[in-house]
Interface confidence: medium
């Protein structure tokens, strides 16, 4: 329904706090560079405002759009032109233009340094001292660097935060306690991150329809005894929620996510067994828990899909008649009977439905043409499963430092034009597929695997595109996204790569990396390791391995030494020279 | 959007039988669940019996017509159908035809429907 007023309906359905909450991460998602204080004067007169249209939503300017209201507020910053160049070219646009011009403007790596935790004494003073501006610079600093973080997700970690930070500053050990629980938090972020710039790709390169399929195979596998029409139901809603949050409108999106939280608690008997645990939840940990629920059991004696899709002698008539429904309950079908398969994969397989009946359905004998499209499904199922198989095991052999490597050794050959960086956090988020996903059960490594890789190489892609400089990537990057993945895994070695030249500096440290944290010494030694397959991309696995091995001894004996300077300045050059050597 | 037309109604005596026909048009008929309801002479809607979206789906039924009823559907001409057996005086009523997301919910004898048929009337009697 309409609303005379749009921010006063948002702020009285979404409360005070998650309304202020939403529109720091709004303004921190756009202006990436701004300060958290200058956010926050922002966000108070945005909601000081709302409430002055709460209070009487004739008020003057309550009835404009939110885009407009926040777009106002953005472009009467001060300098914002020195601050952000041609961003503010973007005010000079009318709405919807305006808006999707600061779309257009966010960066998805930012150049910003790496946020780092302050040590936890100083943590639990400033969050005791002053909760909601603690967590409000976390929303920030989260916000400015991942600009399409899911906002409604990112209040529920925040949420998170705060419950560790409160339960935490009580102990004695603050930092024992304090340090693996934020770190779980942070990786369930971070992953998340990935995982929503990758729906955001999606719908902005392909649209809603390819997003829609996704939820459909999605919410199929989740909620095998639904109908088809209620899965349509829930794929509409989330693939309107998702747009909403992609496209900037976050308000209307937590709004909207709520409203499907609630429909799915009120409708659990036509949805799911398994949701009532959750629905008893405040809000964001409701709508978190239903985004996170388990699969629902199967049901019993499902027919053969064959039946419908194959052996029906209407077929193509019920095809024809409405391609989509017919598509979309195929992959309804086929993704309720496989929670062992990745998205990705069942909508691969429903791609070759289609493309098969469209073949078929033009021929003289339909059902003798498309009768044995099931079977041609088994080459397409089988590759993930081998690539779940030969990198679990893999990973298992060499450990997740181990596997990282070998997959940074293998992008870099197939892309030795990327960027050591890119390819240093690419082939470091890749080799944690294997701690994520290769130790759990069987039916659900193939799912875990492919969706994930498919997140991380999207983020490959988004980085790339900033700055193109691989033909291959470019090709991988430009297909549907579905085939991404697959288009990754059939690179190899760029033939075309003309060695980059042995420089020593590349390969010179200093005492300085003896102090660094572990992570930091193992993305120097990857640094160097990816530098080294630049210069020479056909070296061998044991070559790589001898230098490396050479490279970490050296290493551990200089941070061992008494004048450590003194070891690195003199033992450096040799290590370049064998290095060099061994690489010959 | 579907617009549902009822027909196979009449006048049959006890113990016989009669087969209901729901036509639906629109091109998603595949997308819903459909279902029949009945409405006896001064009695309120009263839940017959439902069929999840495929021709091979789950079907539910109401206790009094258990064993008598079989609900089908045939999607490939957007039909419905109500084969009624062993019929007695109490099954007289007009009978609807409607769509829905779920055959579930319909159970629950909602009265906002999405979509009805304008119903067929169908009595037993000697």
């Known amino acids: 329904e309409a609303h005379k007023s749009e921010i006063a309906h948002r702020f009285k359905d979404l409360g005070e706090q998650h309304f202020k909450g939403l529109v720091l991460i709004a303004f921190s998602q756009y202006l990436q560079k701004c300060p958290y204080e200058e956010h926050i004067k922002l966000v108070q007169e945005v909601t000081d405002f709302a409430k002055t249209c709460v209070a009487d939503e004739n008020a003057e300017n309550c009835d404009k759009s939110i885009h407009t209201l926040f777009g106002d507020k953005l472009c009467a910053i001060p300098k914002l032109r020195d601050n952000y160049g041609e961003l503010a070219d973007c005010c000079a646009k009318q709405e919807p233009e305006r808006n999707e011009c600061f779309l257009q403007h966010k960066d998805d790596n930012p150049n910003l340094p790496p946020f780092q935790r302050p040590e936890a004494e100083a943590m639990c003073t400033s969050f005791q001292e002053n909760p909601t501006s603690f967590l409000g610079h976390y929303l920030h600093e989260v916000a400015r660097r991942h600009p399409y973080f899911y906002a409604p997700e990112l209040l529920y970690y925040a949420e998170k935060y705060n419950e560790v930070l409160t339960q935490c500053c009580t102990e004695s050990d603050k930092a024992a306690c304090l340090t693996p629980k934020l770190d779980a938090v942070k990786e369930k972020a971070l992953v998340a991150a990935v995982r929503q710039r990758m729906k955001c790709s999606s719908m902005q390169r392909f649209g809603e329809r390819a997003f829609k399929a996704w939820a459909v195979a999605r919410m199929s596998q989740r909620f095998p005894n639904a109908e088809f029409a209620e899965i349509t139901k829930l794929a509409t809603d989330v693939t309107k929620i998702n747009k909403e949050c992609c496209h900037g409108d976050l308000l209307e999106c937590a709004d909207d996510r709520a409203e499907l939280a609630k429909y799915m608690c009120e409708n659990q008997a036509t949805i799911s067994s398994k949701l009532q645990a959750c629905c008893d939840k405040p809000v964001l940990q409701k709508s978190q828990c239903l985004a996170e629920i388990e699969h629902d059991n199967i049901p019993a004696d499902l027919p053969s899909i064959a039946a419908d899709f194959v052996e029906d002698k209407e077929v193509c008539k019920n095809y024809a008649e409405a391609k989509d429904v017919f598509l979309g309950t195929f992959l309804y079908e086929y993704s309720r009977r496989h929670p062992d398969y990745s998205v990705s994969l069942l909508l691969r397989l429903a791609k070759k439905y289609e493309a098969t009946l469209e073949k078929c359905c033009a021929e003289g004998d339909p059902p003798a043409c498309y009768g044995t499209v099931l079977a041609e499904f088994q080459p397409l199922v089988e590759e993930p499963k081998n690539l779940v198989k030969t990198n679990c095991e893999l990973y298992e052999k060499l450990g997740e430092y181990g596997f990282q490597n070998a997959v940074l050794v293998r992008y870099t050959q197939k892309a030795p034009q990327v960027s050591t960086p890119t390819l240093v956090e690419a082939a470091r988020n890749l080799g944690r597929v294997g701690t994520k996903c290769c130790t759990l059960p069987e039916a659900q490594r193939l799912p875990c695997v492919e969706d994930y890789l498919s997140a991380i190489l999207n983020r490959l892609c988004v980085l790339h595109e900033k700055t193109p400089v691989s033909e291959k990537v470019t090709k991988c990057c430009s297909g549907s996204l579905v085939e991404r993945r697959p288009c990754f895994s059939a690179l190899t070695v760029d033939e075309t790569y003309v060695p980059k030249e042995f420089k020593a500096e590349t390969f010179t440290f200093h005492s300085d990396i003896c102090t660094l944290p572990d992570k930091e010494k193992q993305i120097k030694k990857q640094t160097a390791l990816a530098e080294l397959v630049k210069h020479k991309p056909k070296a061998t696995e044991d070559q790589l391995k001898t230098v490396m091995g050479d490279f970490a001894q050296f290493v551990d004996k200089c941070c061992k030494a008494a004048d450590k300077d003194n070891c690195f300045a003199t033992e450096g050059p040799n290590l370049v020279a064998r290095s060099k050597e061994a690489l010959a | 959007e579907v617009q549902l037309v009822e027909s196979g109604g009449g006048l049959v005596q006890p113990g016989g039988s009669l087969r209901l026909s729901c036509a639906a048009s629109g091109r998603t008929f595949i997308a819903y669940a459909m279902g029949w309801f009945r409405q006896a002479p001064g009695k309120g809607l009263e839940f017959v019996s439902a069929?999840?979206?495929?021709?091979?789906?789950?079907?539910y039924y109401a206790d009094s017509v258990k064993g008598r009823f079989t609900i089908s559907r045939d999607n490939s001409k957007n039909t419905l159908y109500l084969q009624m057996n062993s019929l007695r005086a109490e099954d007289t009523a007009v009978y609807y035809c409607?769509?829905?997301?779920?055959?579930?919910?319909?159970?629950?004898?909602?009265?906002?429907?999405?979509?009805w048929g304008q119903g067929t009337l169908v009595t037993v009697s000697s």
């Open positions: 069929i999840t979206n495929f021709a091979g789906g789950t079907t």
């Open positions: 409607a769509a829905d997301r779920s055959a579930q919910t319909m159970r629950q004898v909602r009265p906002v429907l999405p979509y």
